[in-house]
């Protein structure tokens, strides 16, 4: 009778992460008597995947009923495959021995390769807000994909950006990979409604590329412009002075009126109006009793926007 051969018909198998891998193995004879074991890798450091005789292997099921006397199919299924499962799997026949079974013959091996989708890209911007004309950096990260080949593009409001640097790690062979990209974006005053998008394309993606977004509203600070104007003199010697605070973002703003350098009133922007570009306008007024002053009055509108150093605009009120 011919000596037993262990046949692994598949040289290689490709499986998607999360799916089940079937590793096929048949023996050509029932003799010698003894169990089958599956290993990942060869040599002394090989990893036991399944032992017909003993042990608990929750992810592994056999294709056939191995308890049947005449069974020669030793194929297994491994569930919920991850990239970490990649490697060469060997079906090994052991001969019954005492005290231990003896390795008799190994199959040629089946190389299991795993394809895994990239995670949804996460885009993060700078920790602190920046003002128009400044360049800010955004990062995009996606993890866990295989194979290594991946494309990443950056867009601002649908326009592709070119000033970015991308790295895929690790550089050498690995079970899965990560991508990290940093893009530089120049802010403009109109960017409150703008979006920065990182787009990742990979062989495993059946839909459009995966996208991660960042709203520039979380990054930009548009400082206000101030204008102080004097309204016509009202009855009882009262003058209405207004401070127009225009085109600022975000809304967080505190205004202080000073009369000749002395604090007259402080208020916080509340009923603001929003411009089309997402910035805000606000107006504050001050009633000044002219008769209470002998000399000219210097009125100052002082604005502290989003925790930044105060900016101010003054107006000289003539007392005639």
């Amino acid at each position: 009778e011919e000596e037993l051969q262990v046949i692994q018909p598949d040289k290689s198998v490709l499986v998607a992460a999360g799916e089940t891998a079937t590793l096929r193995c048949t023996a050509t004879s029932l003799i010698p008597v003894g169990p089958i074991q599956w290993f990942r890798g060869a040599g002394p450091g090989r990893e036991l995947i399944y032992n017909q005789k003993e042990g608990h292997f929750p992810r592994v099921t056999t294709v056939s009923d191995l308890t049947k006397r005449n069974n020669m199919d030793f194929s297994i299924r491994i569930g919920n495959i991850t990239p970490a499962d990649a490697g060469t799997y060997y079906c090994v026949k052991f001969r019954k021995g005492s005290p231990d079974d003896v390795e008799f013959k190994s199959g040629a091996g089946t190389e299991l390769s795993v394809r895994a989708k990239p995670s949804a890209p996460v885009v993060s911007g700078p920790a602190a807000r920046a003002t128009p004309q400044h360049t800010v950096s955004f990062t995009c990260e996606s993890h866990g994909f295989s194979p290594r080949d991946i494309t990443l593009k950056w867009f601002k409001n649908g326009n592709e950006l070119s000033d970015f640097q991308t790295n895929v790690d690790p550089v050498g062979e690995s079970v899965s990979y990560s991508i990290h990209s940093t893009a530089k974006v120049v802010l403009t005053r109109e960017d409150v409604h703008s979006q920065v998008i990182c787009e990742v394309a990979h062989v495993t993606l059946q839909g459009d590329p995966l996208r991660g977004t960042a709203n520039l509203s979380e990054t930009i600070r548009v400082p206000p412009t101030l204008e102080v104007t004097q309204q016509p003199v009202r009855a009882e010697n009262q003058v209405n002075v207004t401070c127009q605070v225009r085109k600022f973002y975000p809304q967080r703003l505190q205004l202080t009126w000073l009369e000749n350098g002395n604090v007259s009133r402080t208020e916080t922007a509340s009923t603001v109006t929003e411009n089309k570009d997402g910035t805000y306008n606000w107006m504050s007024w001050l009633l000044v009793n002219v008769s209470a002053h002998r000399d000219d009055v210097k009125l100052t509108c002082q604005v502290e926007h989003d925790g930044q150093p105060a900016v101010s605009k003054s107006h000289d009120l003539k007392v005639s």
Epitope: L14, T151, A201, V203, T204, Q206, G207, D208
Partner: antibody
Framework: VQLVESGGRLGQPGTSLTLSCTVS????????MGWFRQAPGKGLEYIGI?????SPYYASWVNGRFTISKTSTTMDLKMNSPTTEDTATYFC?????????????WGPGTLVTVSS | DIQMTQSPSSLSASVGDRVTITCRAS??????LAWYQQKPGKAPKLLIY???FLYSGVPSRFSGSGSGTDFTLTISSLQPEDFATYYC???????????FGQGTKVEIK
Amino acid sequence: VQLVESGGRLGQPGTSLTLSCTVSGFSLSSYVMGWFRQAPGKGLEYIGIISSSGSPYYASWVNGRFTISKTSTTMDLKMNSPTTEDTATYFCARVGPLGVDYFNIWGPGTLVTVSS
Amino acid sequence: DIQMTQSPSSLSASVGDRVTITCRASQSINSYLAWYQQKPGKAPKLLIYSASFLYSGVPSRFSGSGSGTDFTLTISSLQPEDFATYYCQSWHYISRSYTFGQGTKVEIK
């Protein structure tokens, strides 16, 4: 799992023609689908794909000559202004479950003849 | 665009022969290469994907190898039903476009 093309016929140059690919056994919202053609006695040529979410992508030579769209169970290929050069058997195909780099399910094809 | 050059364009062989068809890409496509078999009046059938993986139901006499720019389809022992035209097809991960080789017709000697 099955794909069947329809709409192939004898058409006049310049008169638009729409081919359909009807799918069964799977959902078009889960797979990338492609259109290909093969002129008589010639090789296979890629026309374009439509993603699972419905975005079309075309071969560089297409230049607006074809439009790919889909509904829940059919994928269409509109030939916008066909010429005699567009005479071919048109195939639809589905990409494999492991990735978009190969096509594992093909329809039998439908013949389009453009002639005056 | 990537060009795929298949060779030979045709070959004559006998049943039992070992047949090798090659495909060369004009630039690296890594392992994104598929092989199809097509018979007259029929749709292409997938044989090999990702350069070396045998599609389910395809006889093990078919095998694929290669990566980068050079790829090979081997039929270890030609059978009567294998007489057909074979196409390679690439996918480029940057352009996300597909290109076919011009085909190899395998005829009976």
